[in-house]
């Protein structure tokens, strides 16, 4: 995700400041950079977020602010800040003529300019007149006061904060920040207005319909009557979390985002800071039957991003339109005529779908594993939510085939039992962005910052590609994949687990030149093999024979192609074991696999050999997946022969640990 | 030996089309990425469109997307940069570049379009 | 303006060495890999360096390429007076989706 991502409209300006005297003019050679949304029908040009770089202070930033007024005015321009960020970015937010950007760029701390633009409601219809009887009762959910002691903020439409399903449950703060509603002849209806909040506030917490019923809510006005918001209304919104935290800090801290807009580099950045912040953020993945990563908050990495499906598990088609899917969406769940409190009346219900009520039903979720485990940190909560989700249940054929890979098969679900998870070892899988065409182009794919890089992966749909390695950047191990000619592209695969307490280092070993291939172990005492890579600067792997065996009683080797450098993850943590499997199939076939036993985690997904006629590995849960070319096009027999390789670990630390406290 | 070579650039009025043409000889051309890149008079280099060696891949510059659309026939070993709604900031050598950024990066030796009333 | 900033000119003497920057930010340099060209007066660009520090056959070790986080250098020993050209830093940029090169330096060998 990243700021890497979204097919996103990015002016690139390189200005120096050589006009006005500036004194405190950027340092030669910085740029500041200019972003609007792709999506031309959302822009909002005339107003504009000005993002100061990270250490301005918030004088700065009021005085950065009155240096573009007073330059502008010199310029007869007439400009109005309309509010100044501090608390989780630096920054403000000023109306002004598009032809002052040139000028703005130029301030002294200027880091990005972001022109505002629109948010909408993610749900479908806006008003469905299918009123259910009221107090509807789902029988078969009741959980005891789920929930207690977790806040959830609604970031949505004002709502009917007197509605039985959660009166007394919700608190409507006094922050409203939203666009005047299109059309001339539009008449506000209270009704209306409050019907995609109340309906989401109830599905979270609501008496008879929500998921978290203990849960307690503050809502936010940041959409209009009509659904319509501001990635700037938004911005101001999350900053007035933060400070309401800041202020006067509660227990664990959910935020609800029912809301999408075009890819938003200043939407995202303040999630990314809320998130680090200790406040959980679950968004809907929109429903505009594309990518998620071409939206935000949805392509933020820090956020809990949630398509939806229906009944029977299938993802949810909204008319033309439908769930968004793609390596930005984190899990899948119920979005389909879900029923929830109507703003019709004060005992009526009504059902609404879409990705905002898929959204909704796991902030309920979280809410009810954060009141239960008060200390989780995101990343465990995230993994937490993958891991007692259901899997392989959504029919992948409803995505496009190349984002099916990509796309999450998990639909959410709570854990059987809110304590007795700590054992597990937790990991997930993190695709990169796709490289692009050109050989210059890598993939890179990150953890969470608490998250440990464990294994390393590549694919590319064509086979064109030079492997992948880890390494580190910024104090950290990234997965990289390498491009080869011919334009295809590539995707770097990361395993991101949860292991507290690691130490964990690559060992290289360089192209062995020679018949026996390249081999490299973790050689560190109580260091053990938790993934393999392969890398390889030639354009081709050509075939390798013989094949590579991995040697008996060597279980920490990483064995590859004799033109290829290995990289072995070691890593030392309390009570960490780990096993290699190999499934190697002798006949050409498209797809080989390989899985994990029950109590055991897949960390490593590898190929052997690392042949050009392997499009890759990736892990799928808990099972390693190799991918070759279509068995009409691949070779030889002995060619195609090619052997998938897992590595499996588990923790017998975190067992201990979580019978202790039982 | 790797050759290429552009042709259909000329004189065009703005609003007006183009299409430009890369024959490529001396190398199995489908196996590589091709892309077109120009440069205005007196100026620097500026990307303007990749396509991938099977065609199924395509990206664009921002300053023409919506306007120009490269395409290959790898049975005629030709590229293709179809350009409509010509502007005067157009104007420029329109190189023909195979697998820019690689070892196996080469070049033709350009086709000026011009765009003006 | 150009998403990768080089300087507009350098200049040396015959027989010295000169380095050319190229600095840019994450999502290009800091992640992709630096491509060198020359454009001689006239000409068409030529591949002086790949993958930030790979020569291909036929480029003398005259011309070196290194990079460190999100700048990249070109440097040349021994300078020449055909040495005098254009060149350009090129790379991926994955904000952008886009080849992005700096706006070239202009070599002037005294």
């Known amino acids: 995700q990243e700021d890497e991502d979204g097919d996103y409209e990015e002016l690139v300006l390189a200005l120096r400041s050589e006009e006005d005297g500036l004194a405190e003019a950027p340092e030669h050679g910085t740029t500041a950079t200019f972003h609007r949304c792709a999506k031309d029908p959302w822009r909002l040009p005339g107003t504009y977020v000005v993002v100061l770089k990270e250490e301005t202070h918030l004088s700065q930033s009021e005085r950065t602010a009155r240096r573009l007024q007073a330059q502008a005015a010199r310029r007869g321009y007439l400009t109005k800040i309309l509010h100044v960020f501090h608390g989780l970015l630096p920054g403000f937010l000023v109306k002004m003529s598009g032809d002052l950007l040139e000028l703005a760029l130029k301030l002294p701390h200027v880091d990005y300019i972001e022109e505002d633009s629109s948010v909408f409601a993610q749900s479908i219809p806006w008003n469905l007149e299918r009123i259910t009887p009221p107090r509807y009762r789902a029988d078969e959910y009741q959980p005891p006061d789920g929930g207690s002691l977790v806040e959830v903020y609604l970031l949505d439409t004002s709502i009917q904060s007197d509605h039985r399903e959660i009166e007394g449950r919700v608190m409507v703060t006094d922050f409203e920040n939203v666009p005047e509603e299109d059309g001339t002849r539009f008449h506000r209806q209270a009704s209306k207005c409050d019907s995609h909040g109340t309906h989401l506030a109830g599905v979270v917490s609501g008496r008879d319909a929500g998921v978290a019923k203990g849960a307690s809510m503050r809502s936010l006005r940041v959409l209009n009557c009509q659904g319509k918001g501001t990635v700037s209304g938004t911005l101001i919104g999350l900053e007035f979390i933060r400070k309401s935290q800041l202020v006067q800090p509660v227990g664990p801290l959910v935020v609800l985002l029912p809301l999408a807009g075009g890819y938003s580099r200043v939407l995202n950045a303040a999630c990314q800071r809320l998130a680090r912040a200790g406040v959980v953020l679950v968004t809907a993945a929109g429903n505009f039957r594309d990518d998620a990563c071409l939206y935000s908050p949805a392509s933020a990495p820090e956020v809990i991003t949630v398509g939806a499906t229906n009944a029977q598990d299938q993802p949810v088609t909204l008319g033309t339109l439908g769930t968004n899917f793609g390596r930005c969406v984190d899990l899948f769940a119920p979005g389909e005529d879900i029923i929830g409190a109507s703003s019709d009346c004060s005992t009526c219900f009504v059902s609404q779908s879409g990705t905002s009520q898929a959204a909704a039903h796991v902030a309920g979720i979280a809410a009810m594993m954060l009141s239960a485990e008060p200390e989780l940190t995101l990343a465990e909560l995230r993994q937490r939510l993958i891991h007692f989700s259901a899997k392989d249940v959504i029919n992948e054929a409803w995505f496009p085939e190349d984002q099916r890979v990509l796309t999450p098969n998990l639909v959410a679900a709570l854990p059987p039992s809110t304590h007795g998870a700590g054992w597990q070892l937790f990991c997930r899988t993190v695709w990169s962005a796709h490289s692009g065409p050109t050989r210059m182009a890598t993939a890179v794919a990150r953890c969470a910052p608490d998250e440990e890089l464990l294994s390393c992966s590549s694919f590319s749909r064509s086979g064109k590609r030079r492997g992948e390695r880890m390494e580190a950047q910024g104090g950290k191990l990234v997965c990289r994949a390498h491009n080869a000619f011919g334009g295809e592209g590539v995707y770097a695969i990361a395993r991101c687990c949860l292991l507290p307490q690691a130490n964990c280092s690559v060992h290289t070993a360089p192209p062995a030149e020679a018949s026996m291939g390249t081999r490299v172990h973790c050689h560190q005492q109580g260091h053990v093999l938790t993934g393999c890579s392969s890398h390889w600067e030639v354009e081709d792997l050509g075939t390798h024979k013989p094949p590579v065996l991995r040697p008996r009683g060597q279980p920490n080797q990483c064995v590859g192609h004799r033109e290829a450098s290995i990289h072995a993850s070691c890593c030392h943590a309390p009570g960490l074991e780990c096993k290699v499997k190999e499934h190697g199939i002798p006949a050409p076939q498209e797809q080989v696999t390989v899985a994990c036993e029950e109590g055991w985690t897949l960390t490593g997904c590898s190929a052997l050999p690392g042949t050009s006629h392997v499009l890759g590995a990736y892990a799928v849960d808990n099972t390693c997946v190799v991918r070759s070319r279509d068995v009409s096009t691949t070779g030889s027999t002995s060619e195609g022969a090619v052997t998938a390789v897992a590595i499996c670990c588990r923790s017998r630390h975190l067992a201990q640990a979580s019978q202790e406290l039982q | 030996e790797v050759q290429l070579l552009e042709s259909g650039g000329g004189l065009v009025q703005p609003g007006g089309s183009l299409r430009l043409s890369c024959a490529a000889s001396g190398f199995t051309f489908s196996s590589y990425a091709m892309s077109w890149v120009r440069q205005a008079p007196g100026k620097g280099l500026e990307w303007v469109s990749t396509?991938?060696?099977?065609?199924?891949?395509?990206y664009y510059a921002d300053s023409v997307k919506g306007r120009f659309t490269i395409s290959r026939d790898n049975s005629k070993n030709t590229l293709y940069l179809q350009m409509n709604s010509l502007r005067a900031e157009d104007t420029a050598v329109y190189y023909c570049?195979?697998?820019?950024?690689?070892?196996?990066?080469?070049w033709g030796q350009g086709t000026l379009v011009t765009v003006s009333s | 303006q150009s998403v990768l900033t080089q300087p507009p000119s350098v200049s040396a003497a015959p027989g010295q060495k000169v380095t050319i920057s190229c600095s840019g930010s994450?999502?290009?340099?800091?992640?992709?890999?630096v491509s060198w060209y020359q454009q001689l007066p006239g000409t068409a660009p030529k591949l002086l360096i790949y993958?930030?520090?790979k020569r291909p056959s036929g480029i003398p070790d005259r011309f070196s390429g290194s990079n460190s986080g999100t700048s990249a250098t070109l440097g040349i020993t021994g300078l020449q007076t055909g040495d005098e050209a254009d060149y350009y830093c090129?790379?991926?940029?994955?904000?952008?989706?886009?080849?992005?090169f700096g706006g070239g330096t202009k070599l002037t060998v005294l």
């Open positions: 090129g790379t991926w940029d994955s904000s952008l989706s886009a080849v992005v």
């Open positions: 570049a195979k697998e820019v950024g690689s070892p196996f990066d080469y």
């Open positions: 993958d930030n520090n």
């Open positions: 396509i991938s060696g099977s065609g199924g891949r395509t």
């Open positions: 994450n999502s290009n340099i800091g992640n992709n890999y």
